[in-house]
C-alpha cells in the first residue's frame, strides 16, 4: 500500500567524475521496520518475475550478505527513518536513476532518485541584483548545486582576474530539501568597476581550478567629469577673459543635460560644455564647476577656484575682545578684501601711525588703560594700497585708580563726634557703581561714596574704602586718630599691703588704661572736695577722720573720667570713751541707774570692762551697766574700758551720787 511509504530527498543530485555524491534521505514505513534494502542503478520492473532488474549497487538482506560494490556505495540509513546514501567516488556511468528497493514484513517500495554525473566539474552560477549603482552595497551570489562530505571544494571571487579583498561568506546545504554550496560577497562597486569582469572560481581543497562562471558588471553611475581652464592657474586680473571646458570621462547611462555652477549656485543660460567669461570682475572670483546629469543623477566636476585679483578694499578692524580688561591680551585683525592677500599693513591708533606694526594681526599681551581708543589700518598688495576704513573702538576696562579715603571733618576727631569720610578715586572704567568700607559697622551712607559715623568710638582706629565697578579697589586705611577722655580709671592702694590702721602711712595710686591725647591731669576728691592733683594721694599718718569714699579723676583736653568710688577704711582702737548716766549722775536710792560706755572704734568694741573708784573690775561686760535698785553704797566714781581687734581704750572717771530717799531720812 503506497500510502504507507513516505520519502523525502532531493529530486536530482549533481556530481562529476571522481567526485562523490551524498544523498540525504528520510522515509517512513508505517507497518514495521525495514527488513531488506537494495540500491539499483536504472532499475526496470520485470512483469514476468514481478521483480526489478538492474545493477545492484548495494544490497542488505536478513543474512547480512554484502556485494563487493558495497565499499564504494554506503547505506547510511537505518530500519525505520534514515535512508541516506553515499557514493564515493562517483563515476560518469553512475548517471541515471537510482532505485531504492525497500521491503518490510508485509510491504515493498521502489523509490527513484536522479543522479547527474558530468565528465568534468560543472561551473557555478553567479547571481547579480537586477541593477547595480555606484557606492550602493550589493550582494554577489555564486551557487553550485553540489556538496559532498567526502569531497571538499571552495569558491573564490576574482575581479579582472585578481582575487577580491572583500570577505566572502560560504555556506553549504546537505539536506533532504537541497544540496548546494553557496558563496556570498558584499561589495560596494564604484563607477570605475563598470564593465569589469567578475569571476566565481570553483577549486578543490588544494586550490586547484575546477571550473568558473564570469559576469560583466553593469554599474550605473552619474557622469564623471573633468574641467579644464584657460589660463591654467585660474588667476586673472579684472578685465581679463577666462574659458572653462567640461569633459565627460564616463557616464552610465548616457548624460542628458549640462550646466555650470559658481559657489554652488547654477549660472543661468550656460548649458554647453564650454564656459566663456569675458572682462571678469572681482565679483566673479569663486569656485566654478560643471554639472552633467543622467538618469542616475547629476555628476559634478572638481571645483576650479577662479581668482580675480584686485587692490585692497577699504579695511575694517575686528577686536578680540572689546571691552578688554586691563592686563588681559587683545588682538586686532585688519580685514580688507584683496586678491592677492595683502602683504603689508599699516596700523593707526587714534589717527597716529603705530610704528613697527606691519602684520595683519596686532597682538597686545598686556592691555593698559592708555591702549583705549580708535584702531584703524590700511592694507597693501601688489596691485595697490587700500583706503583706511572707519576703525574700531577699544574700550579698556579697569578697576578704579588711585582710591583714597578722605576724612572730611576738621581735626582732631573726638570720641562721640560724627565723622564724615569720602571715598575718592582718580579714574574708573566702567563707572563706579558702589563703595565698600572696612571695617563693617552700622554706619550711614548718606550718598554714594560718603560714610557717616555717628558717635564715633574711642577705639575706631582706621577706616578703608573701596570704589567698585566690576572690581573693587581698596584705598590704604586712614587713621581716624580719635581723641578721647581717659579710660578705665581706677584707685589702687599701693601701701600698706594689708588693712589700714590709724597712724599708717597710706598711698593710693590713680591708674588708667589709655588716653588720647596722652597729656593728663590727676585730681583726687572726697565727698566732692578736691584733695590732690598728683597721680598718687599720700597720707603720712592716716587718721580715722580720713576714712570715707574717694574718687580719682583723670583729665585730658577731651574730658575727665572718674574712678568708681573707693572706700578708705581706717581701723583704730576704741577712743573718746566716756561713761554716760541715765537718768543722770544724781539718783535717789531705790530707783534704777544705767551707766553706758560710749566710744568711737573701728571695728566696733567687742568687749567692755567696768571699774569702780577702787579700780576694781566689776562683773559686767556689756556696754550698759544697770544698777537696780540703786543703793547709797553705789555712789562713787566709775570708768569703763573698751576692747576691739586693734586695741583698748579707757574712759575718764564719772561720778554717780546716790542720795537717800525721804523715807530713809524720815526713819532717821
Amino acid at each position: 500500500d503506497s500510502s504507507k511509504w513516505v520519502f523525502e530527498h532531493p529530486e536530482t543530485l549533481y556530481a562529476w567524475e571522481g567526485a562523490c555524491v551524498w544523498i540525504p534521505c528520510t522515509y517512513r514505513a508505517l507497518d514495521g521496520d525495514l527488513e531488506s534494502f537494495i540500491l539499483f542503478h536504472n532499475p526496470e520492473y520485470n512483469k514476468n518475475t514481478s521483480k526489478f532488474d538492474g545493477t545492484r549497487l548495494y544490497e542488505s538482506t536478513k543474512d547480512g550478505k554484502v556485494p563487493s560494490e558495497q565499499k564504494r556505495v554506503q547505506f547510511l540509513g537505518d530500519k525505520n527513518k534514515n535512508c541516506t546514501l553515499s557514493i564515493h567516488p562517483v563515476h560518469l556511468n553512475d548517471s541515471g536513476q537510482l532505485g531504492l528497493r525497500m521491503e518490510s514484513k508485509t510491504e515493498k517500495w521502489m523509490e527513484r532518485i536522479h543522479l547527474n554525473v558530468s565528465e568534468r566539474p560543472f561551473p557555478p552560477h553567479i547571481q547579480l541584483p537586477p541593477e547595480i549603482q555606484e557606492s550602493q552595497e550589493v550582494t554577489l551570489t555564486c551557487l553550485l548545486n553540489f556538496s559532498c562530505y567526502g569531497y571538499p571544494i571552495q569558491l573564490q571571487w576574482l575581479l579582472e582576474g585578481v582575487p577580491m579583498r572583500q570577505a566572502a561568506v560560504t555556506s553549504t546545504s546537505l539536506t533532504i530539501k537541497s544540496v548546494f554550496t553557496r558563496s556570498e560577497l558584499k561589495f560596494s562597486p564604484q563607477w570605475s568597476h563598470h564593465g569589469k569582469i567578475v569571476t566565481c572560481q570553483l577549486q578543490d581543497a588544494d586550490g586547484k581550478f575546477l571550473s568558473n562562471d564570469t559576469v560583466q558588471l553593469n554599474v550605473k553611475h552619474t557622469p564623471k567629469l573633468e574641467i579644464k581652464v584657460t589660463p591654467s592657474d585660474a588667476i586673472v586680473r579684472e578685465g581679463d577673459s577666462v574659458t572653462m571646458t567640461c569633459e565627460v570621462s564616463s557616464s552610465n547611462p548616457e548624460y542628458t543635460t549640462v550646466s555650470w555652477l559658481k559657489d554652488g549656485t547654477s549660472l543661468k543660460k550656460q548649458n554647453t560644455f564650454t564656459l566663456n567669461l569675458r572682462e571678469v570682475t572681482k565679483d566673479q572670483s569663486g569656485k566654478y564647476c560643471c554639472q552633467v546629469s543622467n538618469d542616475v543623477g547629476p555628476g559634478r566636476s572638481e571645483e576650479v577656484f577662479l581668482q580675480v585679483q584686485y587692490a585692497p578694499e577699504p579695511s575694517t578692524v575686528q577686536i578680540l575682545h572689546s571691552p578688554a580688561v586691563e592686563g588681559s591680551q587683545v588682538e586686532f585683525l585688519c580685514m580688507s578684501l584683496a586678491n592677492p592677500l595683502p602683504t603689508n599693513y599699516t596700523w593707526y591708533h587714534n589717527g597716529k601711525e603705530m610704528q613697527g606694526r606691519t602684520e595683519e594681526k596686532v597682538h597686545i599681551p598686556k592691555i593698559l588703560p592708555w591702549h583705549a581708543g580708535t584702531y584703524s589700518c590700511v592694507a597693501e598688495n601688489i596691485l595697490g594700497t587700500g583706503q583706511r576704513g572707519p576703525g574700531a573702538e577699544l574700550d579698556v576696562q579697569y578697576p578704579p585708580k588711585k582710591v583714597t579715603t578722605v576724612i572730611q571733618n576738621p581735626m582732631p576727631i573726638r570720641e562721640g563726634d560724627t565723622v564724615t569720610l569720602s571715598c575718592n578715586y582718580n579714574s574708573s572704567n566702567p563707572s563706579v557703581t558702589r563703595y565698600e568700607w572696612k571695617p563693617h559697622g552700622a554706619w550711614e551712607e548718606p550718598s554714594l561714596g560718603v560714610l557717616k559715623i555717628q558717635n564715633v568710638g574711642w577705639d575706631n582706629t582706621t577706616i578703608a574704602c573701596a570704589a567698585c565697578n566690576s572690581w573693587c579697589s581698596w584705598a590704604s586705611p586712614v587713621a581716624l586718630n580719635v581723641q578721647y577722655a581717659p579710660r578705665d580709671v581706677r584707685v589702687r592702694k599701693i601701701k600698706p599691703l594689708s588693712e589700714i590702721h590709724s597712724g599708717n602711712s597710706v598711698s593710693l595710686q590713680c591708674d588708667f588704661s589709655s588716653s588720647h591725647p596722652k597729656e593728663v591731669q590727676f585730681f583726687w576728691e572726697k565727698n566732692g572736695r578736691l584733695l590732690g592733683k598728683e597721680s598718687q594721694l599720700n597720707f603720712d599718718s592716716i587718721s580715722p577722720e580720713d576714712a570715707g569714699s574717694y574718687s580719682c579723676w583723670v583729665n585730658n583736653s577731651i574730658g575727665q573720667t572718674a574712678s568708681k568710688a573707693w572706700t578708705l577704711e581706717v581701723l583704730y582702737a576704741p577712743r573718746r570713751l566716756r561713761v554716760s548716766m541715765s537718768p543722770g549722775d544724781q539718783v535717789m536710792e531705790g530707783k534704777s541707774a544705767t551707766l553706758t560706755c560710749e566710744s568711737d572704734a573701728n571695728p566696733p568694741v567687742s568687749h567692755y570692762t567696768w571699774f569702780d573708784w577702787n579700780n576694781q573690775s566689776l562683773p559686767y561686760h556689756s556696754q550698759k551697766l544697770r544698777l537696780e535698785p540703786v543703793k547709797v553704797q553705789h555712789s562713787g566714781a566709775y570708768w569703763c574700758q573698751g576692747t576691739n581687734s586693734v586695741g583698748k581704750g579707757r574712759s575718764p572717771l564719772s561720778t554717780l551720787t546716790v542720795y537717800y530717799s525721804p523715807e530713809t531720812i524720815g526713819r532717821r
Epitope: Q521, F523, E525, N527, G528, R529, L530, K533, G548, S549, W553, N555, G559, Q560, T561, A562, K564, A565, T567
Partner: antibody, heavy 113, light 107 residues
Framework: EVQLQQSGPVLVKPGASVKMSCKAS????????MNWVKQSHGKSLEWIGI????????SYNQKFKGKATLTVDKSSSTAYMELNSLTSEDSAVYYC??????WGQGTSVTVSS | DVQITQSPSYLAASPGETITINCRTS??????LAWYQEKPGKTNKLLIY???TLQSGIPSRFSGSGSGTDFTLTISSLEPEDFAMYYC?????????FGGGTKLEIK
C-alpha cells in the same frame, strides 16, 4: 553758709539755646566739683554731668553729650550750663549741686512755640 | 549704667511710726548709696551717703543700711516735718543714677 543761687525761669522757642547760671558762695568754689541734674515734671532725677571747678574738666552722661555744655568762671565763683537745639523734651527743672550735699533751688526751662 | 529700683513709690504713715524705703541696684555698688529728701520750696537735702553715713545736721531718727545691691532707709518715730519725697542715688560710678522716688504722706 554754703549757698547755690541759680538763675530764674526761662521760656524759649524750639531750636533755640539757653544758658543758665549757678553762683556759689560760702566755700572755696574751685575746691569742689559741681554736678548738674535734670528733673522733668512728675519724673525722677537724671544726672547730666559734672565739672571740675578747678580745671574746667567735664564728664557727661552719654544721653546729654552734645545737648549740654558745662563751664565755670572761677573769678565769679559761677558754674554755667548751656542747652542747645531745645525741644519740648528739654522742658524741666535743672539743678546744680555741690557734690551731693548742697543743691541750688533749680532753674525752670519751658520750651514752647 | 546702673539701674535703680525704688520701692514703694507711695507710702502713708502716721507720726511716731517707723517706716522703711528700699532701693535695689542692677549691679553691686559696694555701699555707695545716698538718700535725699525733697520738699516743695526747699532745696534738696542730703540725709545719708555711703549707705549708712549720716550727713551732719540730720536727726538720728534717719538711718541707712545695706551694701552690694540692696539698701534701706529707715525713719523711726516719724515727725510731721518728715512727710516729703525721698530719693536714693548711687554714687559708686558715673553716670550717677537715681531711684524713681517714694512719696511719704500722712495717713
Amino acid at each position: 553758709e554754703v549757698q547755690l543761687q541759680q538763675s530764674g525761669p526761662v521760656l524759649v522757642k524750639p531750636g533755640a539755646s539757653v544758658k543758665m547760671s549757678c553762683k556759689a558762695s560760702g566755700y572755696t568754689f574751685s575746691d569742689y566739683f559741681m554736678n548738674w541734674v535734670k528733673q522733668s515734671h512728675g519724673k525722677s532725677l537724671e544726672w547730666i554731668g559734672i565739672i571740675n571747678s578747678y580745671s574746667g574738666g567735664t564728664s557727661y552722661n552719654q544721653k546729654f553729650k552734645g545737648k549740654a555744655t558745662l563751664t565755670v568762671d572761677k573769678s565769679s565763683s559761677t558754674a554755667y550750663m548751656e542747652l542747645n537745639s531745645l525741644t519740648s523734651e528739654d522742658s524741666a527743672v535743672y539743678y546744680c549741686a555741690r557734690w551731693m550735699d548742697y543743691w541750688g533751688q533749680g532753674t525752670s526751662v519751658t520750651v514752647s512755640s | 549704667d546702673v539701674q535703680i529700683t525704688q520701692s514703694p513709690s507711695y507710702l502713708a504713715a502716721s507720726p511716731g511710726e517707723t517706716i522703711t524705703i528700699n532701693c535695689r541696684t542692677s549691679e553691686s555698688i559696694s555701699k555707695h548709696l545716698a538718700w535725699y529728701q525733697e520738699k516743695p520750696g526747699k532745696t534738696n537735702k542730703l540725709l545719708i551717703y555711703s549707705g549708712s553715713t549720716l550727713q551732719s545736721g540730720i536727726p538720728s531718727r534717719f538711718s541707712g543700711s545695706g551694701s552690694g545691691t540692696d539698701f534701706t532707709l529707715t525713719i523711726s518715730s516719724l515727725e510731721p516735718e518728715d512727710f516729703a519725697m525721698y530719693y536714693c542715688q548711687q554714687h559708686n560710678e558715673y553716670p550717677w543714677t537715681f531711684g524713681g522716688g517714694t512719696k511719704l504722706e500722712i495717713k
